[in-house]
């Protein structure tokens, strides 16, 4: 506990001190005081450098004195024989004696008192930057006018901080400019402009004079500019050493002017202004900027338009242009958007055709559609080649974006029919010879496939069963084979309006207009065993002449059995209608004269007993197309006959082409593309 005064006596004082003693006293007076230590008696064994016995006075790490021997006062009015004055509030006194004393020594008596120190003058380092004021037990610092005492209560500085500049243009100078700036000051100025403007600082070299750097290059006084995480400076010296125009790229700038205690100069003056934040003219590939400028600044808006074949994809939506705004941070809005090549996507598949998987589906890519040859061909032309257009569609030169249509090739059997022997008198056939042949199982009859959705047959086949079950693609009509073939399901039966419906069909003598169409529920898939027959053209080329040959096929009665198990066929010549009239009806249901013969009927047969018979009805009388010898067309349909194995009558299909086309058009369902 600090005290203001005290007494220190050697051991056994005033008796002789003992040998081999070491004793210390720690003196402490209150802070702000020094210590005056004085000895009134001193009697210690004398030795060189007081090596044997001694009293030692230590202040901190410094030995203030070491005493031995005998002393007496020089002043008769004062008992003090030795004294010490220290400006510190702590002192240590150490007494030591060795192992022997030649005489009897009495030691020492000493006193200490706390004394005031003058902090303003007693120390090498001046405690105050400006004015120092001493008082008993301490001191205080004070400042000249316009200066203020810092929080450390020692340093004075000018009050030059806290100014915030928000105007878009302004001037800032060091305190007292152009008079010397204050020493020992830290001046902070803040420029805060609206977002989107950058602070640009301009200085003139002659407007800058700040205490120069030391030998190590460190500025003693310094001017520093801080913009976000960027710093310009520190700057010092005579004449501004930095760039005379500083673009900070920020709307906020802190200016810090730091001075030390010495070397004041005139200082500095600067101007600043707010520049709209520039945005870089970016190179955005495959696009055009509108408007085009050399420089873009805050709030500028550009429309970036993609070149043809390129698009902006944002989410799932594709656009050809977008707007970008120069933002307050010097960056463009929508900068992530890019003009990418238009992607036409995976091309749509087409019925009965294919498109090879494209290597690329981007703008300019080319794809080719093909039909499943030889059963389908491209109806609407265009060659099947499409390119990815700028609008994101696959486009064909002829069809535009319309997809190609693969339609069945008609009238071309995969294998030609060859008569192996002498239907009645006919030959075994394969369904590949007559891929258009349709089998009706109730009643047992035939028909001809004319396209994906339509079957042509005789009216008398379907008049009693408007929901016939049909089969295609099988040579044999055994149940086991039909189970593995394609069954066709009817949607609607259209009987020619000229066909007379009878209450007792068995007694029919008039087979005029014996023609009907069956619309199918589902399209038929074509292949080697299923493929349509062509319809006759309307030109005179398709008028039949006597002797013209045609092919008939079916599973009707043969010489051997009532129903053929495997398809039979025969080649027959067209004959004059009178030949059919002349044949006696085998099992007449009326007078021979009652049977009607019209120009809507073709008479054919009469050669080698080859003829159609019961169960062949509705099948095609197929004739080679006069304009394309590779194809067959349905010139007739098996209708009726006076007697199997003689001549037969066939519905003349050419006379019904208009009705067929009209019926199909009026009852077609739009293709589900």
């Amino acid at each position: 506990e600090p005290t203001m005064y005290g007494e220190i006596l050697s051991p056994n004082y005033p008796q002789a001190y003992p040998s081999e003693v070491e004793k210390s006293w720690d003196i402490e007076v209150p802070e702000g005081y020094g210590i005056h230590l004085y000895f009134t008696h001193l009697d210690i064994e004398l030795s060189e450098n007081c090596a044997y016995d001694s009293v030692q006075i230590i202040s901190g790490d410094t030995e203030e004195g070491r005493l031995c021997g005998q002393r007496s006062s020089n002043n008769p009015h004062s008992p003090i024989v030795e004294e010490f004055q220290v400006p510190y509030n702590k002192l240590q006194v150490i007494f030591k004696s060795d192992f022997s004393n030649e005489e009897r020594f009495t030691g020492f008596a000493a006193y200490y008192v706390a004394t005031d120190i003058n902090e303003c003058t007693d120390f090498v380092d001046v405690p105050c930057s400006h004015f120092c004021n001493n008082f008993i037990g301490g001191y205080f610092c004070s400042c000249p006018p316009e200066y203020f005492l810092h929080d450390d209560m020692k340093n004075c500085g000018v009050n030059c901080s806290g100014d915030v500049f928000t105007a878009l243009i302004g001037e800032i100078a060091s305190p007292n400019y152009p008079k010397p700036y204050p020493e020992n000051s830290r001046c902070e100025y803040q420029i805060r402009l609206e977002k989107g403007f950058q602070v640009v600082v301009t200085l003139r070299r002659e407007d800058f004079d700040v205490e120069a750097a030391d030998s190590a290059g460190n500025c003693l006084d310094s001017l520093v500019f801080v913009a976000g995480d960027r710093q310009f400076g520190p700057y010092c010296g005579h004449g501004f050493p930095g760039p005379l125009n500083i673009e900070t790229k920020s709307n906020a700038l802190d200016i810090i002017f730091q001075t030390d205690l010495t070397g004041q100069k005139k200082g500095w003056k600067l101007r600043y202004h707010g520049d709209p934040m520039p945005c870089p003219k970016e190179d955005t590939p495959n696009s055009v900027w509108e408007p085009a400028k050399a420089k873009y600044v805050f709030r500028d808006v550009v429309q970036i338009t993609c070149l043809d074949g390129f698009e902006v994809v944002e989410g799932r939506v594709g656009a050809t242009s977008f707007y970008s705004t120069c933002q307050s941070n010097g960056k463009w809005s929508n900068s992530k958007l890019k003009c990418q090549p238009v992607d036409c996507g995976i091309p749509e598949s087409i019925e009965n055709g294919k498109v090879e998987d494209p290597e690329s589906t981007l703008f300019g890519s080319v794809i080719r559609y093909t039909c499943e040859e030889p059963y389908y061909y491209m109806e609407n032309g265009g060659g099947g080649e499409y390119h990815c257009a700028g609008n994101g569609s696959w486009v064909n030169e002829v069809l535009g974006p319309e997809l190609p249509k693969c339609v069945p090739v008609c009238g071309v059997p995969r294998e030609p029919f060859e008569e192996k022997q002498r239907i009645i008198g006919g030959s075994d056939a394969d369904i590949k010879n007559f891929p258009w042949q349709v089998f009706f199982d109730n009643p047992w009859a035939g028909g001809a496939l004319i396209n994906e959705y339509w079957v042509l047959t005789a009216a008398h086949v379907v008049e009693g069963n408007r929901e016939p079950t049909m089969y295609v693609g099988s040579t044999s009509v055994q149940t086991s084979r039909l189970a593995k073939s394609k069954m066709l399901t009817p949607e609607h039966v259209f009987i020619h309006p000229g066909w007379k419906l009878l209450e007792v069909p068995e007694g029919r003598t008039n087979f005029d207009n014996d023609i009907a169409l069956v619309r199918l529920k589902d399209p038929v898939k074509m292949g080697p065993t299923v493929s349509p027959i062509c319809l006759p053209g309307t030109s005179s080329d398709y008028n039949l002449m006597d002797g013209d040959l045609g092919l008939i096929s079916g599973w009707g009665r043969t010489e051997k059995r009532d129903r053929a198990v495997r398809l039979k066929a025969a080649r027959l010549p067209v004959a004059p209608l009178r030949k059919c009239k002349e044949v006696k009806v085998e099992k007449p249901t009326a007078d021979a004269e009652a049977y009607v013969f019209t120009p809507n009927m073709i008479c054919a047969g009469g050669e080698k007993g080859m003829d159609s018979c019961k169960g062949d009805s509705g099948g095609a009388f197929a004739v080679q197309d006069p304009n394309d010898k590779t194809k067959f067309y349905a010139a007739g349909l098996v209708s009726w006959g006076p007697q199997c194995g003689t001549y037969g009558l066939y519905t003349r299909v050419k006379n019904y082409v208009d009705w067929i086309m009209k019926t199909m058009q009026e009852n077609s369902t739009p293709r589900e593309d």
Epitope: D441, T469, S476, V477, Q478, T479, R481, V565
Partner: antibody, heavy 125, light 107 residues
């Protein structure tokens, strides 16, 4: 040439079982239905059972229903008749015969156009 | 079940005779009827199918007719090899039924 050869006949006690087989050749077996017909000594023909081309449809005479089972293995071109709970009145010459079925939805049957020579089954204690 | 009644059960005839055998169905069977010939110790052989259709390879002296419930097998001129037992078979529905048979013997 169409050939049907029956086997598996023999003597069996009442209540016993037998399995008859019919091996087919000379035609596409799985295109045809098949029938079993029997003839008791000195008696007329009696249809026993029939099966369609793929085995999905079968029929039986009232006299054997619940005791006999007809089946076929198209891979082996074979027809079978499993006879259980045999009775004395089942004693007969058993024939297998070929049946033709035409049409896909509306059927036309042509039964028993070819026959085997038969196999004899005797049920006796 | 449909029952088939065949008559006569037997008949005697001479070579060259015209022979007629009748089969009657207990209910209408359209034309789903066949005729079979069986000789002693042999398997039956089909002569006629679908009431009137002659089996391939069968002589044309054999013919069938009828529809519904009444059916006839006719041998226009009996030949020595025709002496046998004849059966009708209905196959309009399961269970199939044979007639009782007609034995044609030499007079």
């Amino acid at each position: 040439e169409v050939q049907l050869v029956e086997s598996g006949g023999g003597v069996v006690r009442p209540g016993g079982s037998l399995r008859l087989s019919c091996a087919a050749s000379g035609f596409t077996f799985d295109d045809y239905g098949m029938s079993w017909v029997r003839q008791a000594p000195g008696k007329g023909l009696e249809w026993v059972s029939g099966i369609n081309w793929e085995g999905g449809s079968t029929g039986y005479a009232d006299s054997v229903k619940g005791r006999f089972t007809i089946s076929r293995d198209n891979a082996k071109n074979s027809l079978y008749l499993q006879m259980n709970s045999l009775r004395a009145e089942d004693t007969a010459l058993y024939y297998c015969a070929r049946d033709e079925q035409l049409g896909g939805n509306h059927y036309y049957y042509y039964y028993m156009d070819a026959w085997g020579k038969g196999t004899t089954v005797t049920v006796s204690s | 079940d449909i029952q088939m009644t065949q008559s006569p059960s037997s008949l005697s005839a001479s070579v060259g005779d015209r022979v007629t055998i009748t089969c009657r169905a207990s209910q209408g069977i359209r034309n789903d009827l066949g005729w079979y010939q069986q000789k002693p110790g042999k398997a039956p052989k089909r002569l006629i199918y679908t009431a009137s259709n002659l089996q391939s390879g069968v002589p044309s002296r054999f013919s069938g007719s009828g529809s519904g419930t009444e059916f006839t097998l006719t041998i226009s001129s009996l030949q020595p090899e025709d002496f046998a037992t004849y059966y009708c078979l209905q196959y309009a529905s399961y269970p199939l039924k044979f007639g009782g048979g007609t034995k044609v013997e030499i007079k």
